[in-house]
C-alpha cells in the first residue's frame, strides 16, 4: 500500500501552502525507500536517493513556480509514481447568513471569507439549542446535530424544514479543503431572521364618483403558510406619478382606500408585509401597481327631482404594469388634500 495518505481531493495531487515547507510523497514505493525526484519533462535531478529523506521530497518555502508535476524513481530506475503539487491556503471560517420567509422553515447561505485556491467543500448541520438555566446549556440527543440539506447543483445554500418558531438554532458550516477545515457557528432564531416575501396580487382601482380615491387590494404571499395564529400586517405606500416622495399608511387588512389621491394623475402603489407581532423585519416592497382616480363629471341630463348624486367618468384601472404617460400640465388641485370637496355633486 502507498506510504502517502490521500488528502481529500483528486487522486495524484498533493497540497502545500505558499511560503511554507512542503513535503511530497512518492506514492508507488514502500515507506522509507530512497528515491530520485525530477520535475516532469526536465532531466535535472531535484533530490537524489542519498538525501536521507527516503520516499519524500522537501521543498523549502514553496512558491508558485514549484507547482506542477513531479516524478519519483526507485534505485533501479523504475517509476515510483507521479505527483502534482498544488499550492493554496487552509480554509478560513466561511461567512454565513440565514433567512426565513415563513415561520416553519429557514435557509442559510454561505460564502468563503478567503479564497483558498484549493478544492473546497462545505459540511452543513444544525442543532436546536436547549437552554436550562440563566447561562447553562445542555446537549441532549433530541437536539441534534442534524444535517442541513444542501441545495443540489452546488448552490451555497441549505434549508432547515419544520423549524420551531420559538426555538434557537446553532448552524454549523464547515469549510473543508486538503489543508484542513474551519467552522463557523451561527446562532439564529426564527423570530429574528423572519422576513416574509412581499404581498402578491396588488390591484389598484378607482372608486367611481370619487376623484380623490383609490382602492388597493392584495393577498398574502404564497409562501406564507395558511394558519390563523401567525398573521401578517402590511404597510402601503403610494405617490402620484412624477412625485418623488411616498406617502405611507398601515392598512388594517388586505385592502386600503386612499382618500387623498391627486385627481387625474396616475399613482404608483406598493405594499410590504411583516409578522403582525413585529418578529423579524419588513418584506421587500411588492412590484408597483398603478391606478388613476376616476374623474367625476356633471351629467348631461339633470333629473327633474332635486337630488344629490355622484357619477363616475371612467372605468376603474386595474394593475397596469407601467404608468400611463401623465400629462405634463400642472394640475390645478395638486395641493388640495381636502376630502370634503371630493365628490362631484349637482343639486337640482
Amino acid at each position: 500500500s502507498s506510504p502517502c495518505p490521500q488528502a481529500w481531493g483528486p487522486p495524484g495531487v498533493q497540497y502545500g501552502q505558499p511560503g511554507r515547507s512542503v513535503k511530497l510523497c512518492c506514492p508507488g514505493v514502500t515507506a522509507g525507500d530512497p528515491v530520485s525526484w525530477f520535475r516532469d519533462g526536465e532531466p535535472k535531478l531535484l533530490q537524489g536517493p542519498d538525501s536521507g529523506l527516503g520516499h519524500e521530497l522537501v521543498l523549502a518555502q514553496a512558491d508558485s513556480t514549484d507547482e506542477g508535476t513531479y516524478i519519483c524513481q526507485t534505485l533501479d530506475g523504475a517509476l515510483g509514481g507521479t505527483v502534482t503539487l498544488q499550492l493554496g491556503y487552509p480554509p478560513a471560517r466561511p461567512v454565513v447568513s440565514c433567512q426565513a420567509a415563513d415561520y416553519e422553515n429557514f435557509s442559510c447561505t454561505w460564502s468563503p471569507s478567503q479564497i483558498s485556491g484549493l478544492p473546497t467543500r462545505y459540511l452543513t448541520s444544525y442543532r436546536k439549542k436547549t437552554v436550562l438555566g440563566a447561562d447553562s446549556q445542555r446537549r441532549s440527543p433530541s437536539t441534534g446535530p442534524w444535517p442541513c440539506p444542501q441545495d443540489p447543483l452546488g448552490a451555497a445554500r441549505c434549508v432547515v424544514h419544520g423549524a420551531e418558531f420559538w426555538s434557537q438554532y446553532r448552524i454549523n458550516v464547515t469549510e473543508v479543503n486538503p489543508l484542513g477545515a474551519s467552522t463557523r457557528l451561527l446562532d439564529v432564531s426564527l423570530q429574528s431572521i423572519l422576513r416574509p416575501d412581499p404581498p402578491q396580487g396588488l390591484r389598484v382601482e378607482s372608486v367611481p364618483g370619487y376623484p380623490r380615491r383609490l382602492r388597493a387590494s392584495w393577498t398574502y404571499p404564497a409562501s406564507w403558510p395558511c394558519q390563523p395564529h401567525f398573521l401578517l400586517k402590511f404597510r402601503l405606500q403610494y405617490r402620484p406619478a412624477q412625485h418623488p416622495a411616498w406617502s405611507t399608511v398601515e392598512p388594517a387588512g388586505l385592502e386600503e382606500v386612499i382618500t387623498d389621491a391627486v385627481a387625474g394623475l396616475p399613482h404608483a402603489v406598493r405594499v410590504s408585509a411583516r409578522d403582525f407581532l413585529d418578529a423579524g423585519t419588513w418584506s421587500t416592497w411588492s412590484p408597483e401597481a398603478w391606478g388613476t382616480p376616476s374623474t367625476g363629471t356633471i351629467p348631461k341630463e339633470i333629473p327633474a327631482w332635486g337630488q344629490l348624486h355622484t357619477q363616475p367618468e371612467v372605468e376603474p384601472q386595474v394593475d397596469s404594469p407601467a404608468p400611463p404617460r401623465p400629462s405634463l400640465q400642472p394640475h390645478p388641485r395638486l395641493l388640495d388634500h381636502r376630502d370634503s370637496v371630493e365628490q362631484v355633486a349637482v343639486l337640482a
Epitope: A92, V95, T109, S111, P112, S113, Q114, I115, L186
Partner: antibody, heavy 118, light 107 residues
C-alpha cells in the same frame, strides 16, 4: 508594493451622500474579504462593513444599516462604500482594510476623512 | 453585539518596563481576538492575531494570551517607538467589535 489607498472623502451636508473608493495593489484582491473601519476624531475604532471575496455576502454595523452600501469590483481591484443620508455622527476617518478571513485586518489604508456638517 | 472592555484606559511606563493590558469580552469568543497598535495620525497595525499568534514582522517583545472572555497583551520591554494606542478586537462574531483602546506613553 502591497497597499490600499482610500479616496472620496470630503465635506458633505447632513442628509447628503458620498462614495468612498479603496484601490488595492500588490496582492490578489479578489481572494480576500474587505472591510471599512472608521474612527471619529479623538475616538476609537468602529467596524462599519465587510464584504466577502465574491461579493455575494455583506455585513453592516447597526449604526449604518440601510444607509451605507459596501461593494467591490474585482476586475478593478477596488472596494467601495456608498454613504447616503449622512449624519454628523458619521464624521470620521474611514479606513479600508483587508482580511485574512473575515474580521481580522492585516493591511490598512491611510484613511480618508469624511466630515458631515452644515 | 459582543462588547469589548479594556483596562487600563491609559498608562505611563519607563523604557524597559513590562507593560500588560487586559481585554474582556461580554461573552465567550474562544481565541478569536486580535491586538492592534495605532500611532498618532497613522492607520492601525495588526500585532497579534487569534489571541497569541505574532503577526509576521512584529518584534517578539509583543505577546498575547488568553481564551474565552479574558485576554492579556504584553510588551516585555517597553521601547520608545511603542508609544501608541493599543486596541483589542474580537472576530468570533460576524460583526467584529473593538475595545475602547489603551493609550501607552513613556514616563
Amino acid at each position: 508594493e502591497v497597499q490600499l489607498l482610500e479616496s472620496g472623502g470630503g465635506l458633505v451636508q447632513p442628509g447628503g451622500s458620498l462614495r468612498l473608493s479603496c484601490a488595492a495593489s500588490g496582492f490578489t484582491f479578489s481572494g480576500y474579504s474587505m472591510t471599512w473601519v472608521r474612527q471619529a476624531p479623538g475616538k476609537g475604532l468602529e467596524w462599519v462593513s465587510s464584504i466577502v471575496p465574491y461579493g455575494d455576502l455583506t455585513q453592516y454595523a447597526d449604526s449604518v444599516k440601510g444607509r451605507f452600501t459596501i461593494s467591490r469590483d474585482n476586475s478593478k481591484n477596488t472596494l467601495y462604500l456608498q454613504m447616503n443620508s449622512l449624519r454628523a455622527e458619521d464624521t470620521a476617518v474611514y479606513y479600508c482594510a483587508k482580511g485574512p478571513g473575515w474580521g481580522s485586518f492585516d493591511l490598512w489604508g491611510r484613511g480618508t476623512l469624511v466630515t458631515v456638517s452644515s | 453585539d459582543i462588547q469589548m472592555t479594556q483596562s487600563p484606559s491609559s498608562l505611563s511606563a519607563s523604557v524597559g518596563d513590562r507593560v500588560t493590558i487586559t481585554c474582556q469580552a461580554s461573552q465567550d469568543i474562544n481565541n478569536y481576538l486580535n491586538w492592534y497598535q495605532q500611532k498618532p495620525g497613522k492607520a492601525p497595525k495588526l500585532l497579534i492575531y487569534d489571541a497569541s499568534n505574532l503577526q509576521t514582522g512584529v518584534p517578539s517583545r509583543f505577546s498575547g494570551s488568553g481564551s474565552g472572555t479574558d485576554f492579556t497583551f504584553t510588551i516585555s520591554s517597553l521601547q520608545p517607538e511603542d508609544i501608541a494606542t493599543y486596541y483589542c478586537q474580537q472576530h468570533e462574531s460576524q460583526s467584529p467589535t473593538f475595545g475602547p483602546g489603551t493609550k501607552v506613553d513613556i514616563k
